[in-house]
Interface confidence: medium
């Protein structure tokens, strides 16, 4: 499977809400011995590879923001914690998963990475990520709502397998 990012750039005004989205394409293993883990984190455009560094989003680490399987939160405390920070991660059964950030500030600008790990117990781990940029703007040049820029076909598939 691979992860695509429908939009590579989100330009949003301060105070607005933004939902960043990733999509899993292709077959994902199913069964008792398979765990699908999804999460989000901030990163930087590394020289070697995008999304290698993992930084917190609003002080929440990628561990705090993770989802298991088809969107079941691993722990309610994690979910509550995210909501207290104006964040919510969600997942559907069509391969889409997202993070919603409420009341954006300039500090939210950065490179956001979604991570999917397929754990085939007793066998291997397959890791894939996608990246997108969020620019939060203020002042007269800021858009009234979020403006999204579609990924080019090349950029939309950020594949890293482990």
């Amino acid at each position: 499977f691979k992860v695509t990012t429908p939009y590579s750039l989100y330009v949003c005004p301060e105070g607005q809400n933004a939902t960043l989205t990733c999509r899993i394409l292709g077959p994902v293993s199913k069964g008792h011995d398979v765990t699908i883990y999804k999460t989000w984190y901030l990163s930087s455009r590394g020289e070697v590879q995008m999304c290698s560094e993992r930084r917190p989003i609003r002080n929440l680490t990628f561990q705090d923001l993770h989802l298991h399987h088809g969107g079941h939160q691993a722990a309610n405390t994690s979910h509550d914690l995210a909501q207290r920070h104006g964040l919510e991660s969600a997942s559907d059964h069509h391969g889409n998963f997202s993070i919603t950030m409420r009341n954006l500030t300039l500090l939210d600008s950065g490179l956001y990475c979604c991570l999917v790990v397929e754990i085939r117990h007793h066998h291997s781990e397959h890791r894939v990520h996608g990246a997108m940029e969020l620019q939060v703007q203020t002042g007269k040049d800021a858009p009234s709502n979020c403006v999204v820029y579609p990924s080019s076909s090349q950029d939309s598939e950020n594949i890293t397998a482990a």
């Epitope: 993992r54 561990q63 993770h66 790990v117 117990h121 066998h123």
Partner: antibody, heavy 118, light 106 residues
Framework: EVQLQQSGPELVKPGASMKISCKAS????????MNWVKQSHVKNLEWIGL????????SYNQKFKGKATLTVDKSSSTAYMELLSLTSEDSAVYYC???????????WGQGTSVTVSS | QIVLTQSPAIMSASPGEKVTMTCSAS?????MYWYQQKPGSSPRLLIY???NLASGVPLRFSGSGSGTSYSLTISRMEAEDAATYYC?????????FGSGTKLEIK
Amino acid sequence: EVQLQQSGPELVKPGASMKISCKASGFSFTGYTMNWVKQSHVKNLEWIGLISPYNGGTSYNQKFKGKATLTVDKSSSTAYMELLSLTSEDSAVYYCARRAYGYAMDYWGQGTSVTVSS
Amino acid sequence: QIVLTQSPAIMSASPGEKVTMTCSASSSVSYMYWYQQKPGSSPRLLIYDTSNLASGVPLRFSGSGSGTSYSLTISRMEAEDAATYYCQQWSSYPFTFGSGTKLEIK
């Protein structure tokens, strides 16, 4: 503060079994896998296996299947490893360590020393 | 299983000296992880995903590599860096560690 507190040292007789505990605090227990690692003078570090408190799923190093049994008690945020039919080769320090999926073992217990001797 | 071979097994360095140790994998792995262990203590995570420093790790440590060849470098050796260093892979089961490089201070 993240902590993994393991049970104390053990001196056991050959053929006996024993259980080591690892009490987790300071983080969401179900958001990580709990891994167990053996350290002996002969083999350095060896990964024994992991358990996911989220769903109880386990993965073992084939070498330790039948030797180690991993369980968790979610209510007390405690992971356990039972070691069966002990021999002198099982004398070692055993560590528990938490791991987030797609990451590394970022916090370790202090280790439990097990000595098998008659 | 993937065998990780570390070299050298033992090395010594003077304060301020640059130190490099290597980890060779029997099959290709996607990422390498490095741990530091001092006598009487538990292992401590140093490097994740080949080249990223774990929280609280001094900037003099760095990691690099790909495929079957990886390395850990200390730009300027300090007395507190004397320890045993282990590489580890999570790419395929069973997860394995290298045999360790013991770094001593001259």
